[in-house]
Interface confidence: low
């Protein structure tokens, strides 16, 4: 029977800068029941606080609701593991909410084949930003990436769309069924998961008339 091993805070994510969650990996349990507590203080403060919500984020997590989240300050946090034989502490982690945003995937992905007269046909892709993100405040710049591939192909073709919420793709294989997905990231943050795939059948007469 030993004191617990050193825990590690391995991930913190925020969907929208308004709330965030951090997760830790327990160290070895030393063969005894082990309690974990996360404590933190904000930059410019000396007061230590305990995690406000150990439930919402699931096991080994701490969730910071709106009233505990400030994007103006760095959070300095650590996890304490305690059993009957002693305690151990994780390394301090510095968390800036601005830099841990991982939005939900974009919504309302729509894909359409356009064949304008006397022009090259193209695939027109359109989407909406995730609901939780408020772009009007100017606090967020969302960047988008599209991926698509023929249904049976192994490789994805990636296109970077910048801040646009629509995109045109010209070079496609006629007669193929394509999968299309889109994802987004804040200007400094993490890519969202890919949106659910949308399927589109490319007509056989999708020809390139130069």
């Amino acid at each position: 029977q030993l004191p617990p091993g050193k825990p590690e805070i391995f991930k913190c994510r925020s969907p929208n800068k308004e709330t965030f969650t951090c997760w830790w990996r327990p160290g070895t349990d030393g063969g005894l029941p082990t309690n974990y507590s996360l404590t933190y203080h904000r930059e410019g403060e000396t007061l230590m606080h305990e995690c406000p919500d150990y439930i919402t984020g699931g096991p080994n997590s701490c969730h910071f609701g709106k009233q505990y989240t400030s994007m103006w300050r760095t959070y300095i946090m650590m996890v304490n593991a305690t059993n009957q034989m002693g305690s151990s502490f994780s390394d301090e982690l510095y968390v800036d909410v601005t830099y841990i945003v991982q939005p939900d995937p974009p919504l309302e992905l729509a894909v359409e084949v356009k064949q304008p007269e006397d022009r090259k046909p193209y695939l027109w892709i359109k989407w909406s930003p995730p609901t939780l993100i408020d772009l009007k405040t100017g606090w967020f710049t969302l960047l988008y990436e599209i991926r698509l591939k023929p249904e049976k192909a192994a490789e994805w073709e990636i296109h970077f769309a910048g801040q646009q919420t629509e995109f045109k793709i010209l070079s496609l294989h006629p007669g193929q069924k394509y999968l299309v997905q889109v994802r987004c990231k804040p200007d400094h943050g993490y890519w969202s998961a890919w949106s659910p795939a949308t399927f589109i059948q490319i007509p056989s007469d999708f020809t390139m008339n130069d």
Epitope: E43, E45, L47, W139, D187
Partner: antibody, heavy 118, light 111 residues
Framework: EVQLLESGGGLVQPGGSLRLSCAAS????????NHWVRQAPGKGLEWVSD????????NYADSVKGRFTISRDNSKNTLYLQMNSLRAEDTAVYYC???????????WGQGTLVTVTS | QSVLTQPPSASGTPGQRVTISCTGS?????????VHWYQQLPGTAPKLLIY???VRPSGVPDRFSGSKSGTSASLAISGLRSEDEADYYC???????????FGGGTKLTVL
């Protein structure tokens, strides 16, 4: 070696404008907050403004709000202070400073003198 | 009004211990914000001397120490030396101003 080098100071008439620059070297500029702090001749330090790493957030002292604009170009490792509607009381040495975790100012430039007089 | 108040001057003889106070209010030091101290030698830019109330950056002699209690902070210099003659400023974030506050500065003279 961390270096901050201010430029752009000089003599200007009341109501005029100046743009100060601060060239940074010796560290990853985009990883730090940055500040402007000024010091009137024979007086103490007065914080003017700060800006976050990716320019998402800016703060200003009440005395300059609406007249001064802080900005940065991370590709050029340069901090700026656009000063409009200058007044005699803006006369000071202007320092740029690097901000660390609690945004404390850990390195300072040598300053550039701005003189506002008619 | 938010201010950090420091005595305008302080003095001591070589080898003595000198303390400089910095008094704030409930919107800055008393709110829980940490205090930083800067040293400005004549004709030079300020230099970070103490941060987060009592931490010395590398290269700062252990003759310099800081403390904080309630709405006040203090800087102590022991074993005073002639090269310590300088202006000393405290600084803290102020919640009501949403900005940094510097104390008025204390001119330290080594007699």
């Amino acid at each position: 070696e961390v270096q901050l080098l201010e430029s752009g100071g000089g003599l200007v008439q009341p109501g005029g404008s100046l743009r100060l620059s601060c060239a940074a070297s010796g560290f990853t500029f985009s990883s730090y907050w940055n500040h402007w702090v000024r010091q009137a001749p024979g007086k103490g330090l007065e914080w003017v403004s700060d800006i976050s790493r990716a320019s998402s957030y800016t703060n200003y002292a009440d005395s300059v709000k609406g007249r001064f604009t802080i900005s940065r170009d991370n590709s050029k490792n340069t901090l700026y202070l656009q000063m409009n509607s200058l007044r005699a009381e803006d006369t000071a040495v202007y320092y740029c400073a690097r901000g660390l975790d609690a945004r404390r100012m850990d390195y300072w430039g040598q300053g550039t003198l701005v003189t506002v007089t008619s | 009004q938010s201010v950090l108040t420091q005595p305008p001057s302080a003095s001591g003889t070589p080898g003595q211990r000198v303390t400089i106070s910095c008094t704030g209010s409930s919107s800055n030091i008393g709110y829980g914000y940490v205090v930083h101290w800067y040293q400005q030698l004549p004709g030079t830019a300020p230099k970070l001397l103490i941060y987060r109330n009592n931490v010395r950056p590398s290269g700062v002699p252990d003759r310099f120490s800081g403390s904080k209690s309630g709405t006040s902070a203090s800087l102590a210099i022991s074993g005073l030396r002639s090269e310590d003659e300088a202006d000393y400023y405290c600084a803290a974030w102020d919640d009501s101003l949403n900005g940094w506050l510097f104390g008025g500065g204390t001119k330290l003279t080594v007699l």
